[in-house]
């Protein structure tokens, strides 16, 4: 999962390839982490179930000025059909737990690796 291999092809990529690329980006972030990721910024935790890509984007988009996760933010927008912007929370419920971006990325990475291996969600 950590090796891209080959050149990026023009046009659409298969969904499994897009997911693999997202996983690879999250791996890069966790491996290259020297100082606290995004200066230890806190984000809302999410449930890793249906709607998690949009929820993850909504959570991470509120972290500004952190170049380390900009690519992840861009990539996640391709997994979510809805327009998500900073400061906008679609949740009607008050999210009750905040965690560090580093932990958020780690949790998301572990879950996506599991999904990629199993090749299923529902």
């Amino acid at each position: 999962l950590t090796c891209l291999g080959g050149f990026a092809s023009p046009g659409p990529v298969p969904p499994s390839t897009a997911l693999r690329e997202l996983i690879e980006e999250l791996v890069n972030i966790t491996q290259n982490q020297k100082a606290p990721l995004c200066n230890g910024s806190m984000v809302w935790s999410i449930n890793l179930t249906a709607g998690m890509y949009c929820a993850a984007l909504e959570s991470l988009i509120n972290v500004s000025g952190c170049s380390a996760i900009e690519k992840t933010q861009r990539m996640l927008s391709g997994f979510c059909p809805h327009k998500v912007s900073a400061g906008q929370f679609s949740s009607l419920h008050v999210r009750d737990t905040k965690i560090e971006v580093a932990q958020f990325v780690k949790d998301l990475l572990l879950h996506l690796k599991k999904l990629f291996r199993e090749g299923q969600f529902n």
Partner: antibody, heavy 123, light 112 residues
Framework: EVQLVQSGAEVKKPGASVKVSCKAS????????VSWVRQAPGQGLEWIGE????????YYNEKFRGKATMTTDTSTSTAYMELRSLRSDDTAVYYC????????????????WGQGTTVTVSS | DVVMTQSPLSLPVTLGQPASISCRSS???????????LHWYQQRPGQSPRLLIY???NRFSGVPDRFSGSGSGTDFTLKISRVEAEDVGVYYC?????????FGGGTKVEIK
Amino acid sequence: EVQLVQSGAEVKKPGASVKVSCKASGYTFTTYGVSWVRQAPGQGLEWIGEIYPGNYNTYYNEKFRGKATMTTDTSTSTAYMELRSLRSDDTAVYYCSRWRTSYFSDYGYFDYWGQGTTVTVSS
Amino acid sequence: DVVMTQSPLSLPVTLGQPASISCRSSQSLVHSHGNTYLHWYQQRPGQSPRLLIYTVSNRFSGVPDRFSGSGSGTDFTLKISRVEAEDVGVYYCSQSTHVPYTFGGGTKVEIK
């Protein structure tokens, strides 16, 4: 067997509100979204919005923002949609449907539908 | 919003004969990940819509193999190889590549 059972028909006066329910069974409620679609008399289908019970995130068709509010109760596997400031042109059959996504994105399709709830707005 | 245009509006068919419904979208429905989120629903008289085909050509569980979907980009087709009496109703195409998700106006299939 997947089932979505909706509440019964409603007759309301203009300006009133109505809350339609959709009880899900036969699957894990939080691993799918729930969408709402309306069908006015003799008309086609119109997507209102979707809600993800597992994350509580809601997304609306801009046309229905401020008109519809979607909620869920995970303890009873029930989705709700409230319509406010009802007008005669809100008269329609309202359907809930299960929004099936895949493991690799939140894109998907409506795979199972409720029987529909008729809302009539008349003075 | 993406406009979905179906033709014909009405389709009188003879039992046992094939039928074909066309659906055209105002924008390409190909997502950057490669999937095309174009689906077909059947609504029998007095009933709720029912999923027939998802992502262009995948038959949903329990759907008879006389139903098939094809197409790409902006042009899609639903085919019924041999129409049966239970196939009477309105057929809708729908896209979920772009928000808001939209439906075609429907094609009414009736027996001649």
